[in-house]
Interface confidence: medium
């Protein structure tokens, strides 16, 4: 933004006319006292935007701040705004006028404040006085802002001399506001109730002897008043309690309940509010998703968690294959449902050192007299693979076969590999993968069986080798999601009299 003349402070003659120009790369506007005075806006051929503010027949009342700002950036950082301060010395204007409220300066702590008495002429000497005193106070004065410093709770006036005339400003009142010393807390027996149940709220004040309670609540707005009960908590000094009890709540009793407490000696006050919800009937709602297929690893512990909201408190049952589960005495299963907030619950099923037999269909059911919800999932027990057998044989057909058998859950993949150079394999040479597409003259036949009782897959794979002309290291590797296992056998040609 470019302002002409640049300022930052100008002194102009009374009754004169003056032109202010502001230009920028985006639309610009002049502001005076948060308003936009009449101005001429234009856009040049080179894409520059400008605004011209013509000040005519200037008076002392034109003294003050002028801002040029991008039209769409009001309220942004100061580098998006150019400030200009104009003085128009005018002997007919003493101190610049104030809004009545500007004459009050409110404080809550000891801090520097500004008494904003301003004059039209930067050459004038301005002094600050207590309203009832003649002595000038040693406080620095800024002609653009006023007197800044730390002030007592008093009334102050500013004085200046214009020609041979002494001029006083309006009185400014510095008010230190009271900070409430009341400590109020509000709580409810429950913030969610069913229609027909009771709403009971308590408002407690600590450390004050003489207080007045005022409750605001939805029923009050419709003219149906409820008389609160106030008592003292005898075991605690100066703990005063007001109880608001609404029997047989209606849906319209939902809303904000506010306890306003006034302390009559120092006239302090504080208020706290709480929201109450009245529901037509109870509810149970699942929160979040639980997949229909869950996994656990054999011999490891696994916790399955369900989060839900409910009111009133529900009964929670867990089932496996339609049979009710309970905490087992052997400590193999642990069930817990805990209340994490007034209406939110977490129910957990923990299987300790999971066994194959614990695979199956699990259901959690949460219910009360008004509603119920259930969540089901299948639990699969993952079993790391094991190679149970790796054997080599010489059928009469002349070919040589290697048979690999293994088990695991989920279904294992089988990988065959071979190595011809026994000395360098597998440390230096990578083994060659075998199979139907391998360069080896080999054939592969794999069968998979699912054993229901053990809840795992068995893989049997037979590798047929057509021509084995020198010793060969054959490796069978089984892999699944939870592990892998490998065994190795040395296959020797028929002609050789030994086997390793």
């Amino acid at each position: 933004l470019v302002v002409t003349p640049p300022g930052p402070e100008l002194v102009l003659n009374v009754s004169s006319t003056f032109v202010l120009t502001c230009s920028g790369s985006a639309p610009v506007v002049w502001e005076r006292m948060s308003q936009e005075p009449p101005q001429e806006m234009a856009k040049a051929q080179d894409g520059t935007f400008s605004s011209v503010l013509t000040l005519t027949n200037l008076t002392g009342l034109d003294t003050g701040e002028y801002f040029c700002t991008h039209n769409d950036s009001r309220g942004l950082e100061t580098d998006e705004r150019k400030r200009l301060y104009i003085f128009v010395p005018d002997p007919t204007v003493g101190f610049l006028p104030n809004d009545a409220e500007e004459l009050f300066i409110f404080l809550t702590e000891i801090t520097e404040i500004t008494i904003p008495c301003r004059v039209t002429d930067p050459q004038l000497v301005v002094t600050l006085h207590e309203k009832k005193g003649d002595v000038a106070l040693p406080v620095p004065y800024d002609h653009q802002r006023g007197f800044s410093g730390i002030f007592e709770d008093r009334s102050y006036i500013c004085k200046t001399t214009i020609g041979d005339r002494e001029v006083d400003s309006d009185a400014y009142y510095v008010y230190r506001l009271q900070v409430s010393s009341i400590n109020v807390s509000v709580n409810a027996v429950q913030t969610v109730v069913r229609q027909g149940e009771n709403i009971t709220l308590m408002c407690i004040v600590i450390g004050n002897e003489v207080v007045n309670f005022e409750w605001t609540y939805p029923r009050k707005e419709s003219g149906r008043l409820v008389e609160p009960v106030t008592d003292f908590l005898l075991d605690m000094p100066y703990h005063i309690r007001s109880i608001l009890h609404i029997p047989s709540a209606e849906l319209e009793d939902s809303g904000t309940y506010t306890c306003n407490v006034t302390e009559s000696v120092n006239d302090h006050q504080d208020e706290k509010a709480i929201n109450i919800t009245v529901v037509e009937s109870g509810y149970v709602r699942l929160l979040g998703e639980v997949g229909t297929l869950q996994f656990a690893e054999l011999h490891r512990s696994r916790t399955l968690q369900v989060v839900f909201e409910a009111y009133p408190p529900p009964t929670v049952l867990w089932f496996k294959d339609n049979r009710t589960l309970g905490d087992s005495s052997a400590g193999e299963i642990a069930l817990s449902t805990r209340n994490v907030s007034e209406t939110r619950y977490v129910s957990e099923l923990t299987l300790v050192r999971v066994k194959v037999a614990e695979a199956g269909h699990y259901t959690m059911r949460a219910f009360h007299e008004d509603a119920e919800v259930q969540l089901s999932f299948q639990l699969q027990i993952n079993v790391p693979v094991r190679v149970l057998e790796l054997s080599e044989s010489h059928p009469d057909s002349g070919e040589q076969t290697v048979r690999c058998r293994g088990r695991g859950m989920p279904q294992p993949n089988i990988i065959w590999s071979a190595c011809r150079d026994l000395k360098r394999c597998p440390r230096e040479l990578p083994p060659t993968l075998l199979g139907n597409s391998s360069e080896e003259e080999s054939q592969l036949e794999t069968n998979v069986t699912y054993w229901e009782e053990e809840q795992e897959f068995e893989v049997v794979s037979t590798l047929r080798l057509q021509h084995v002309d020198r010793p060969l290291s054959v490796r069978c590797t089984l892999r699944n999601a939870v592990g892998q296992d490998t065994q190795e056998v040395i296959v020797v040609p028929h002609s050789l009299p030994f086997k390793v």
Epitope: F104, F106, T108, S155, Y173, Y175, L177, Q178, V179, S180, E214, N260, T262, D267, H268, Q269
Partner: nanobody, 118 residues
């Protein structure tokens, strides 16, 4: 909560007088201030007169000497006596209440229209 109800506005001849009243009800705390403000279209709201419960009164320069603010704390009511009215005093006059304490909020009435005809 504090409720404010203004009355007394209407049509007045230039040079004439009007008296506005504002009655406060609800949680009235002391000390407090009560004020009268006005807002012309396209202008900032201007507080023209203000009175505190401990007896301080102040006025905007534009109304000083013509308007007088007074209070009746027994009735929780503030008055604005408007004399020597000018056409530029035409406005919606709104009453405000604020407790003089930290964190207190301003409560405003609905306003009463004063129209000064020339």
């Amino acid at each position: 909560e504090v409720q404010l109800v203004e009355s007394g506005g209407g049509l007045v001849q230039a040079g004439g007088s009007a008296r506005l009243s504002c009655a406060a009800s609800g949680s009235i705390l002391s000390p407090n201030l009560m004020a009268w403000s006005r807002q012309a279209p396209g202008k900032q709201r201007e507080v023209v007169a203000l009175a505190t419960s401990d007896g301080i009164t102040t006025y905007a320069t534009s109304v000083k000497g013509r308007f007088t603010i007074s209070r009746d704390d027994a009735k929780n009511t503030v008055y604005l006596q408007m004399n020597s009215l000018k056409p530029e005093d035409t406005n919606l006059y709104t009453c405000k209440y604020r407790a003089l304490r930290a964190g207190a909020v301003d409560y405003w009435g609905q306003g009463t229209q004063v129209t000064v005809s020339s």
